[in-house]
């Protein structure tokens, strides 16, 4: 009965070999998407010389095939259960998914540029870095191929900067046979209600970016739940993508190819200001873009990135307060299409379908000393890209789920 | 408070090299990057160039490269210049200069009490 | 490189005169002009920093103006103490250049 599914659920979700999780785990059967939307500037001059309004024009889907790696170094340590290992990085670009080729050309922020005064305060080096700018002829916006934008380009400004930096400059460079992790989780061999909980990141328990509580790693890797989910429950997870621990909550219950899950979201409250959510006070780590800690959907991850300043928030500025996305047109956030969600079957725990959504921004600031950016009249978040990342069981895998899990069940 | 000692007067023989030194005091020295300023006799002021003094960067003004040599100590907080091949124009007095980063920059708001290097056979 | 002309040369001004410096750039610097006062045997003396803003300390007496390429010094009434050299210098652009000087005398 009951009792007999408890425990064979209980056998078959731990990471160890020979189980069912084990497999999908080391590699998921799921086939994962990436979809790109590029913000194309249309009146970069106009906003360089006047400070006026960032038009933008989102082009895509462009899309990728992601997460088709198995991790890599996998280590069970049986003294305190748990399994390490790292999640290798790939994208293969999909032609067929994509409304163009990786040489399309866009108009977009120049990050180099932009971040520089960022990073480099001190008046006499804006100076120096002013005359290197101009040299390499860049300005405030350039064009660039999808290529080079998401994976990487040689900066003409940045090869001129005498100090020891990386030349190359890319959303997600580097990104290509590179690894996310050592991750250690819990296997859920001693206790069931803690599998694929994060134990460490990196050989951290915190991640040494935010004050206080925020700066845990909370929950799993969101492919995975501890089993027999309850829709009261909170599901944690940790996206190193966003440099932070998040939370979803029970929205719907939804059919997913016969399988009955349960689509967890994620609240408008985890993007709140502290004024709204009291508990996000340590996600605003600065006063001045914040407005003093009250603008709210955008996180600046910029201890994670370097010091580069980098905002994640959902795309379009969904669930973002007015004055962020003010200086900004051609925006229409749409909560269905812009929101991120997870399907979980809860007998398991296993994450059957996802849409993760999130946006890539960039701050740039006036400096009077880079002449690309001393008539600029406020700061603007600039919407660089907004990415769908999806993957759903396949049609097989699903008829052996009902037929294993929840068949049984009935 | 900020101070900038400079090395005394130099005499030197022409063709020769010179290396004159400036000691900060009273501030964290490798916060601020240090200037230097050559003033010909009754003549006007010319930046030669600055150096960060966190970590040598140096940065000249085209005039005086191969001419003038920017170096650091950051154990003696002290930042020196040295003047190589020296001709009678390069006779004058040499300044280190800081700068004071408040809610605006001013430039050369510190300066030194100035080396004279005289070029002479 | 930004060339600043600075004129005149040398001014001979009576006690509580207004006295006027000038110093026009090649080059469109915005406000990004500096002031110096320097007397014989001393190192010069910042008195106006960027965007016409007066160093603490520095008497409401001295005051600059201008924007983009042509800059104006003034003194009030002047002074005694005031007969010194004065130099202009652009910090817009490398390399940082002075004018040539304006030497302040008492007629």
């Known amino acids: 009965g009951d009792m007999l599914i408890e425990k064979t659920i209980k056998r078959e979700v731990v990471l160890e070999e020979g189980t069912t999780a084990f497999k999908n785990w080391v590699k998921t059967g799921t086939t994962v998407y990436r979809q790109f939307w590029i913000f194309d500037v249309q009146n970069p001059d106009d906003v360089a010389k006047n400070s006026s309004k960032i038009k933008v024009k989102q082009r895509g889907p462009y899309t990728y095939r992601v997460r088709y790696l198995a991790k890599e170094n996998i280590t069970q340590d049986p003294e305190d259960h748990t399994v390490s290992f790292v999640q290798p990085n790939g994208a293969i670009f999909e032609p067929s998914l994509s409304v163009g080729t990786e040489d399309d050309n866009f108009t977009v922020l120049n990050l180099a540029v932009a971040a520089a005064p960022h990073i480099y305060q001190n008046s006499f080096v804006q100076v120096v870095l002013n005359s290197l700018i101009k040299k390499s002829k860049s300005s405030m916006f350039q064009t660039r191929s999808l290529k080079e934008l998401l994976w990487g380009y040689k900066d003409p400004f940045l090869s001129l900067v005498p100090y020891p930096i990386s030349t190359t400059v890319g959303v997600f460079y580097p990104y290509n046979d590179t690894v996310d992790g050592v991750y250690k989780v819990f296997n859920g061999k001693d206790n069931i209600s803690k599998v694929a909980i994060i134990e460490s990141y990196k050989g951290k328990r915190n991640l040494s970016y935010w004050p206080s509580y925020c700066d845990m790693i909370n929950g799993t890797d969101a492919a995975s739940f501890p089993p027999f989910v309850e829709k009261s429950r909170t599901l944690r997870f940790f996206s190193s993508d966003i440099c932070r621990s998040i939370y979803a909550v029970f929205g719907s219950e939804i059919d997913l190819k016969g399988i009955p899950v349960y689509r967890f979201v994620l609240p408008a409250n985890a993007f709140a200001s502290p004024l709204q959510n009291p508990d996000n006070h340590c996600f605003c780590t600065e006063k001045v873009i914040s407005n003093n800690c009250t603008s709210y959907g955008v996180l600046d991850i910029g201890k994670c990135k370097e010091g580069k300043p980098v905002y994640i928030s959902l795309p379009h500025f969904l669930h973002a307060s007015p004055d962020v996305s003010e200086p900004i047109e051609g925006l229409h956030p749409n909560e269905d299409e812009h929101r991120t969600y997870l399907d979980v079957e809860p007998i398991t725990g296993f994450t059957l379908q996802f849409a993760k959504r999130l946006q890539v921004n960039i701050l740039v600031k006036p400096a009077r000393k880079i002449e690309a950016l001393k008539n600029l009249k406020r700061p603007y978040i600039v919407p660089i890209l907004w990415l769908n990342e999806t993957g759903t069981i396949g049609d097989e895998k699903a008829e052996m789920f009902k037929t294993q899990v929840t068949g049984k069940i009935k | 408070q900020v101070q900038l000692q400079q090395s005394g007067a130099e005499l030197v023989m022409p063709g020769a090299s010179v290396k004159m030194s400036c000691k900060a005091s009273g501030y964290t020295f490798t916060d601020y990057w240090m200037h230097w300023v050559k003033q010909r006799p009754g003549q006007g002021l010319e930046w030669i160039g600055a150096i960060d003094t966190s970590d040598s960067y140096t940065s000249y003004n085209q005039k005086f490269k191969g001419k003038a040599t920017l170096t650091v100590d950051e154990s003696s907080s002290t930042a020196y210049m040295q003047l190589s091949s020296l001709t009678s124009e390069d006779s004058a007095v040499y300044y280190c200069a800081r700068d004071y980063y408040g809610s605006s920059t001013a430039w050369f708001a510190y300066w030194g009490q100035g080396t004279l290097v005289t070029v002479s056979a | 490189e930004t060339t600043v002309t600075q004129s005149p040369a040398s001014l001979s001004m009576a006690i509580g005169e207004k006295v006027t410096i000038r110093c026009i750039t090649s080059?469109?610097?915005?406000?990004?002009m500096n002031w110096y006062q320097q007397k014989p045997g001393e190192p010069p003396k910042l008195l106006i920093s960027e965007g016409n803003t007066l160093r603490p300390g520095v008497p409401s007496r001295f005051s600059s103006s201008g924007y983009g390429t042509d800059f104006v010094f003034t003194i009030d009434n002047m002074l005694s103490e005031d007969v010194a050299d004065y130099y202009c210098?652009?910090?817009?652009?490398?390399?940082?250049?002075f004018g040539s000087g304006t030497k302040l005398e008492i007629k």
């Open positions: 080059t469109d610097i915005d406000d990004d």
């Open positions: 210098l652009q910090s817009d652009n490398l390399p940082f250049t």
